[in-house]
């Protein structure tokens, strides 16, 4: 087992978290992907898209919307008006089903704070981008937390871009308990995709 | 360890067909797009074009300068990208370089030695 | 198409000096946060070498006296201290859209 690298975002309360969730592989281009948050030892996925995953085609529910770029292997996370209670650890992963989900990246640590009311934003610090590299060896990491550059005095409807530049992508099995994941390699995940793909035909067939 | 290997270069009149081949090893060939490139002597870089996966029906794109005179196509059981060249013209002459990208748009994190293609009478 | 210019075209630098070495887009090649440009050096004979990818990110292997800047249209590639094994052809790239296209390449040299 390995741990992963967490990071940690702190934001207040009425801020868009954006997530750039990079798979970068064509064959994961129409697989479902969502968005989940870990809840004790399972995942809760908040948000997903269709299966297949449509292309450029948005995916809201509630305040998440989800919008796919096939074309750039980018699936894009967006979560407005953040509140204190969506505090956590998330994840962008390709979904299978609960017990079963790729995640994509090292998880988000999300911490959402009060803000101090009728502060005025300065238009510099309004939008920003965080850029989160994976890691592209499978190593054990500590957990490490680093925090955005600060947003002082940011505006309610300040947006916090998140992105995930990669040479290669790591992809994990999220098995029972979030620091406790198994690296698996492109290929190994792509043969496990085919295969249960294969049942899933078979199974209707 | 990934490794590239292009043949089938050598002499050709102008007007001549010639194809490129590149054996890939080291990788899920299937899974990445496959991309030729080339360079004339003493000039540039020039990308020729590239193929995608089965997930997306194999598109193939084009630099201008050889679109529908070049054809790249790939097998994935032999682990094999090729390029069929016609219609030759002496502005062809170049090393051709086979080039595996690092995922959808991205990188070239890996290339062939090369195959030189002569165009001459 | 998009463009991509080199400047300069030929470059001269001391040794253990600052090599600079900038690509304009003649559009945007970022999509949302990411640049789709990257840096390659080549030396005589041998295939290019990736060195940065989408505009800052280091290549594993490749020494962090490489850094890579810029979004949107233009670009740097920075070698921080020039070594002898530095001499080379360097390439920008951006894969943003298609076709790809590479600029014309700068030619470093030790002065």
């Known amino acids: 087992t390995t741990e992963l690298t967490e990071e940690k975002y702190e934001y207040k309360e009425g801020q868009t978290l954006e997530v750039k969730c990079d798979y970068t592989l064509e064959k994961f281009a129409s697989s479902q992907k969502a968005w989940q948050k870990m809840e004790g030892k399972m995942p809760k996925i908040l948000a997903k898209t269709e299966r297949p995953s449509k292309n450029s085609h948005p995916v809201q529910v509630g305040r998440i919307t989800l919008e796919d770029y096939h074309d750039h292997g980018l699936l894009q996370v967006q979560m407005t008006n953040l509140q204190v209670e969506d505090s956590g650890l998330y994840q962008c992963v390709i979904y299978q089903h609960p017990k079963e989900s790729h995640v994509l990246f090292n998880p988000i640590c999300l911490v959402v704070t009060k803000g101090s009311s009728g502060t005025p934003g300065s238009s510099e610090n309004s939008t920003q981008n965080v850029y989160r590299t994976p890691s592209t060896t499978a190593k054990a990491l500590g957990p490490r937390y680093t925090s955005p550059r600060t947003v002082t005095q940011a505006p309610p409807e300040s947006t916090v871009v998140v992105s995930t530049p990669g040479s290669e992508i790591n992809l994990t099995n999220v098995t029972d308990i979030i620091r406790e994941q198994k690296l698996i390699s492109e290929e190994d995940l792509e043969q496990k995709l085919i295969s249960e793909e294969d049942l899933h035909h078979h199974h209707h067939h | 360890e990934v490794q590239l290997v292009e043949s089938g270069g050598g002499l050709v009149q102008p007007g001549g067909s010639l194809k490129l081949s590149c054996a890939a090893s080291g990788f899920t060939f299937s899974t990445y797009a496959m991309h030729w490139v080339r360079q004339a002597s003493g000039k540039g870089l020039e990308w020729v074009g590239r193929i995608r996966t089965k997930s997306s029906n194999y598109a193939t794109y084009y630099a201008a300068s050889v679109k529908g005179r070049f054809t790249i196509s790939r097998d994935d059981s032999k682990n094999t990208a090729y390029l069929q060249m016609n219609s030759l013209k002496t502005e062809d002459t170049a090393v051709y370089y086979c080039?595996?990208?690092?995922?959808?748009?991205?990188?070239?994190?890996?290339w062939g030695q090369g195959t030189l293609v002569t165009v001459s009478s | 198409d998009i463009v991509l210019t080199q400047s300069p075209d030929s470059l001269a630098v001391s040794l253990g000096e600052r090599a600079t070495i900038n690509c304009r887009a003649s559009?945007?090649?970022?999509?949302?946060?990411?640049?789709?440009l990257h840096w390659y050096q080549q030396k005589p004979g041998q295939p290019p070498k990736l060195l940065i990818y989408r505009a800052s990110n280091l290549e594993s292997g490749v020494p962090d006296r490489f850094s890579g800047s810029g979004s949107g249209t233009d670009f740097t590639l920075t070698i921080s201290s020039l070594q002898a094994e530095d001499v080379a052809v360097y390439y920008c790239q951006q894969s943003n859209e298609d076709p790809y296209t590479f600029g014309q390449g700068t030619k470093l040299e030790i002065k």
């Open positions: 559009e945007s090649v970022d999509t949302f946060d990411y640049s789709f």
């Open positions: 080039t595996r990208d690092m995922g959808i748009r991205r990188q070239f994190a890996y």
